[in-house]
């Protein structure tokens, strides 16, 4: 799955929480990728879209259904986490059960925690229903731990 980037021109700040040394995120559809000069926090997010039905098209990235849903979800996340420290999302997967969406969100390290990731997504559910016709339920967010996590450093004010 291609990575969707939050395109912005701010320097990555040093911070605390999960730290992983990763290369810059890249994307085929964004001309500017943020340079990740320090750490990134990753969060695994899953939710149900209860007004859609899963079918085999969502197993094939070349289908219109897959591409349209992926585009709407990517757009929605760019709206919810409006840049600042949001670096993008990746690994969107669709599963049966109405439609279950699973993905990974990347944020500038130390700028957000798991509770606020979930809170802001939940706050946006009503707007998602009206703007994208997606009825969202069963939201679950968790930290993505990295075994190669570096020592946490003090956060540069955001």
């Amino acid at each position: 799955t291609p990575t969707t980037l939050a395109s912005h021109s701010t320097k990555t700040d040093a911070s605390s929480t999960h730290h992983s040394s990763v290369p810059p995120l890249t994307s085929s559809n964004h001309s500017t990728s943020p340079q990740l000069s320090t750490g990134v926090s990753f969060f695994f997010l899953s939710f149900h879209i209860s007004n859609l039905q899963f079918n085999s098209s969502l197993e094939d990235p070349s289908t219109d259904y897959y591409q349209e849903l992926q585009r709407d979800i990517s757009e929605m996340f760019l709206q919810i986490y409006k840049q600042g420290g949001f670096l993008g999302l990746s690994n969107i997967k669709f599963r049966p059960g109405s439609v279950v969406v699973q993905l990974t969100l990347a944020f500038r390290e130390g700028t957000i925690n798991v509770h606020d990731v979930e809170t802001q997504f939940n706050q946006y559910k009503t707007e998602a229903a009206s703007r994208y016709n997606l009825t969202i339920s069963d939201v679950s967010v968790s930290d993505v731990p990295f075994p190669f996590s570096a020592q946490s450093g003090a956060g540069v004010p955001g």
Epitope: T10, K82, G84, G85, F86, T111, I112, H115, Q120, Q123
Partner: antibody, heavy 119, light 107 residues
Amino acid sequence: QVQLVQSGAEVKKPGSSVKISCKTSGYAFSNFWMNWVRQAPGQGLEWIGQIYPGDGDTNYNAKFKGRVTLTADKSTSTAYMELSSLRSEATAVYFCARSYYRSAWFAYWGQGTLVTVSS
Amino acid sequence: EILLTQSPDFQSVTPKEKVTFTCRASQSIGTSIHWYQQKPNQSPKLLIKYASESISGVPSRFSGSGSGTDFTLTINSLESEDIATYYCQQSNNWPLTFGQGTKLEIK
């Protein structure tokens, strides 16, 4: 470095309006939420609302909705807060403060603007 | 709306003393609490984010802990420059809210 510089103190009559500015520098203005916080004399801090200059998206504390308008001018990297139908209770210091997200913490603050509402 | 209650409202302290502030949320907010210091006629200054995460430039004598509904800010060895009012703020729900503050004064 990041700087938020607010306009000077204002004295206003009840029923009038006031527009406070917060001029920023040292970061990409469009990419961060700008929040406004009120502090009445001798009182605590109260969140008024926020604007995302990139697209003008706003969120308001219900307590202030209808009496406060937040705007942003990307060309000058300046955020504005307009208070209308002023009452004496609006006498306070108003701060602008930058955040990463809709719900977040505030690492950078303006110096504050005192608005006095008096007849 | 999440109500944050700080205690005490006022605290009389002496230099080198260990000082503890508490902030209680009206419902569980995970670790979405942030602490600020405000001196008279100044803007608030961020001390701790997400309950316990340190901020560069803030002296190491300031630390935070807690999760759910009960949070603590500690100054390990108070210095005279720490005399100020301290506020907690939550980012777990709209509207964003602050505690009423705890004011430190010298004994």
